[in-house]
């Protein structure tokens, strides 16, 4: 029962986590810029993995994809790759774990097969969660190290001036969604791995075996280790595998040559 609960909970937690990773990957608020007041309208910029958006105080929002950008840094491509790998692994893990669930019967699938599938899905969830956490952390590090503050001024050769708008890049909501989602997927994966141990078939324990004595109707239950080693309550010093299961006092003594001396 506990194994089924652990497996089921692990599945649900992983499902929520992977949904969160997908949401984070699609969100535009990976990095946000402090709202700056243009004399015409207040403008709020935010950027995701795939596009950049601007929202005006009027509520108007415009987003543009990065395909027009001349060069995307390798780090951004790496973050994209990590998030996609996380989603793919998580999706496969979910598919495998559905068939591995103890509460679902598919044909004559043995517990050992379910245990293996549970372990496989658990490992996939762990790797998926780690990919998401890594991706979000790499992006956060990029913001902190390279793009936190932007204040430089420069001039064009045409006589007009180009001034960098003073904007501060801060962590967007998607980063926190990604961290939490990655953590949930990781936890779900660990729970699946724990559940796998409970699903695995244990070695057969041979406990009580009845021995019938030849010529006697006495049933004998072996005393196990304690009896065979002289420990425990075997006060009468029974012979363990004696066919008749009798004490030494009851052993029939056959006549010897010394009896007649």
């Amino acid at each position: 029962m506990a194994v089924t609960a652990c497996q089921g909970l692990g599945f649900v937690v992983s499902l929520i986590g992977i949904a969160g990773i997908i949401a984070a990957t699609c969100m535009d608020q990976w990095s946000t810029q402090d709202l700056y007041n243009n004399p015409v309208t207040a403008v709020f910029n935010y950027q995701g993995l795939w596009r950049s958006c601007v929202r005006e105080s009027s509520g108007f929002t415009e987003c543009r994809g990065y395909f027009t950008l001349l060069g995307l840094p390798a780090m951004l491509q790496a973050v994209r790759a990590l998030m996609i790998v996380g989603i793919v692994l998580g999706a496969i893990g979910l598919l495998v774990s559905i068939f591995a669930l103890k509460c679902i019967r598919i044909g004559s699938m043995e517990d050992s097969a379910k245990a293996n599938m549970t372990l496989t899905s658990g490992i996939m969830f762990i790797v998926s969660g780690l990919c998401a956490i890594a991706g979000v952390s790499v992006f956060a590090n990029m913001l902190v190290t390279n793009f936190w503050m932007s204040t430089a001024n420069m001039y064009t050769g045409m006589g007009g001036m180009v001034q960098t708008v003073q904007t501060r890049y801060t962590f967007g909501a998607a980063l926190f969604v990604g961290w939490v989602a990655g953590g949930l997927t990781l936890i779900g994966g660990v729970m699946m791995c724990i559940a796998c141990r409970g699903l695995a078939p244990e070695e057969t324990n041979y406990k009580a075996v009845s021995y019938h004595a030849s010529g006697h109707s006495v049933a004998y239950k072996p005393g196990g280790f304690k009896a065979s080693t002289g420990f425990g309550s075997n006060t009468k010093n029974k012979k363990i595998y004696d066919g008749g299961a009798r004490t030494e006092d009851e052993v029939q003594s056959y006549p010897s040559k010394h009896d007649y001396v």
Epitope: S31, T41, Q47, S58, T68, G71, V162, V165
Partner: nanobody
Amino acid sequence: EVQVVESGGGLVQPGGSLRLSCAASGSIFSINVMGWYRQAPGKQRELVAGISTGGTTRYADSAKGRFTISRDNAKNTVYLQMNSLKPEDTAVYYCNADLATATSWPVRYLEVWGQGTLVTVSA
């Protein structure tokens, strides 16, 4: 390189009309706001009119009812139609654009100014 270039300035009689144009060019990712500012001799630079991507407009009190700003987002161009011009409208008119360059990521927003075009209102 990103730049904005103004055109359409010149000498005009009081009560006359003039249409200024400003085109942004270069590696532009997007433009948030485009506007016109003016600076009369010995005075501070002031906003005449501005327009955002979403169509939000703002006019200086002295320009309301006489000037109209419009924008062509596809061409990254802003226009200022000036009617009923007065001698006090004489100034150097500067184009301003808040834009994002397509040369870096994350997208950096720049405030780009033109070199200005002179508008003289005189009889």
